[in-house]
């Protein structure tokens, strides 16, 4: 039975040209994390593998930085970066847990961080 929950940074906003940290945290399970995939809609941004380290997709290499931890930092944000982001935790023996973050990139300087929320 999958008992874990993914806590994410939730709905967040950031200014155009700025950067933002996407963070997920898996709790309430003793399952071993073997890999974390970061995806934007259906595009793979990056993979962090327990044995093999990081792989950043070539098309995002200039704008994505690994970390902190298993998180991902998006840099030089554009309005086109607005949308859904997913952290996909591959674990043993539980299987896959997915967390969702919605990022809105704003033209103005009124960007504020949203509240944290949990996805069971």
């Amino acid at each position: 039975m999958m008992t874990g929950t993914i806590e994410t940074t939730g709905n967040i906003s950031a200014e155009k040209g700025g950067s933002i940290i996407l963070q997920c945290h898996l709790s309430s399970t003793t399952a071993q994390v073997t890999q974390v995939n970061w995806e934007q809609q259906d595009q793979l941004l990056a993979i962090c593998n327990a044995d093999l380290g990081w792989h950043i997709s070539p098309s995002f290499k200039d704008r994505v930085a690994p970390g902190p931890g298993l998180g991902l930092t998006l840099q030089s944000l554009t309005v086109n970066d607005t949308g859904e982001y997913f952290c996909i935790y591959h674990t043993y023996p539980d299987g896959t847990y997915t967390g969702r973050i919605f990022l809105e990139v704003l033209e103005s300087s009124v960007a504020e961080h949203g509240a944290r929320f949990q996805i069971p």
């Epitope: 071993q32 994390v33 327990a50 380290g53 990081w54």
Partner: antibody, heavy 119, light 107 residues
Framework: EFQLQQSGPELVKPGASVKISCRAS????????MNWVQQTNGKSLEWIGV????????NYNQKFRDKATLTVDHSSSAAYMQLNSLTSEDSAVYFC????????????WGTGTTVTVSS | DIQMTQSPASLSASVGETVTITCRAS??????LAWYQQKQGKSPQLLAY???TLAEGVPSRFSGSGSGTQFSLKISSLQSEDFGSYYC?????????FGGGTNLEIK
């Protein structure tokens, strides 16, 4: 104390194979992945590949993909590397070295095994 | 593959001196860099990882710094036991690669 004890030196003929061992002690064998590293002529180090003892998954440096085969034996907490079709260029010291989960540096190294390929 | 270039290849220094070894990566590896020390006929030993975190038991006279593509290892007040070879290794993503090494010898 964490230890990785490797098998003794090997003198092998060109074209032959050799299997060297790395016995782990002082920690949970399946909690750390095992890497193998080649050192030629006491010079620099080259990563050969890694095996995850818990899952049996392997990943190889492209250069060594047809040269090395990595395996583990849980009953003896040992990792093995078989080198095939040996040539004089494979003469080197081979080290096993462990790395932790999401920690991709080598915090404990084996004692080293010298392989000499000569007719 | 990411290439790691170390300099100098060899270095002579006296006990008590301060030396710096540098390592350059062919592409951005952020802070994913480790340093190892190896004595003649022995196995390498981890000195530092994540560019600047010292491994357990490593004396504070060792310090690592850098990020991106440029890194350095500084050894202050050299001790006789510090002489040997030093290697950098990126630990960003496979294949892991090492620098060519720096041989630190007694002057």
């Amino acid at each position: 104390e964490f230890q990785l004890q490797q098998s003794g030196p090997e003198l092998v003929k060109p074209g032959a194979s050799v299997k060297i061992s790395c016995r782990a002690s002082g920690y949970s064998f399946t909690a750390y992945s095992m890497n193998w590293v080649q050192q030629t002529n006491g010079k620099s180090l080259e990563w050969i590949g890694v095996i995850n003892p818990k899952f049996g998954t392997t990943n190889y440096n492209q250069k060594f993909r047809d040269k090395a085969t990595l395996t583990v034996d849980h009953s003896s907490s040992a990792a093995y590397m078989q080198l095939n079709s040996l040539t004089s260029e494979d003469s080197a010291v081979y080290f096993c070295a462990r790395n932790g989960n999401f920690a991709w540096y080598f915090d404990v190294w084996g004692t080293g095994t010298t392989v000499t390929v000569s007719s | 593959d990411i290439q790691m270039t170390q300099s100098p290849a060899s270095l002579s220094a006296s006990v008590g001196e301060t030396v710096t070894i540098t390592c350059r990566a062919s592409e951005n590896i952020f802070s994913y860099l480790a340093w190892y020390q190896q004595k003649q006929g022995k196995s390498p030993q981890l000195l530092a990882y994540n560019a600047e975190t010292l491994a357990e038991g490593v004396p504070s006279r060792f310090s690592g710094s850098g990020s991106g593509t440029q890194f350095s290892l500084k050894i202050s007040s050299l001790q006789s036991e510090d002489f040997g070879s030093y290697y950098c290794q990126h630990h960003f993503g496979v294949p892991w690669t090492f620098g060519g090494g720096t041989n630190l010898e007694i002057k």
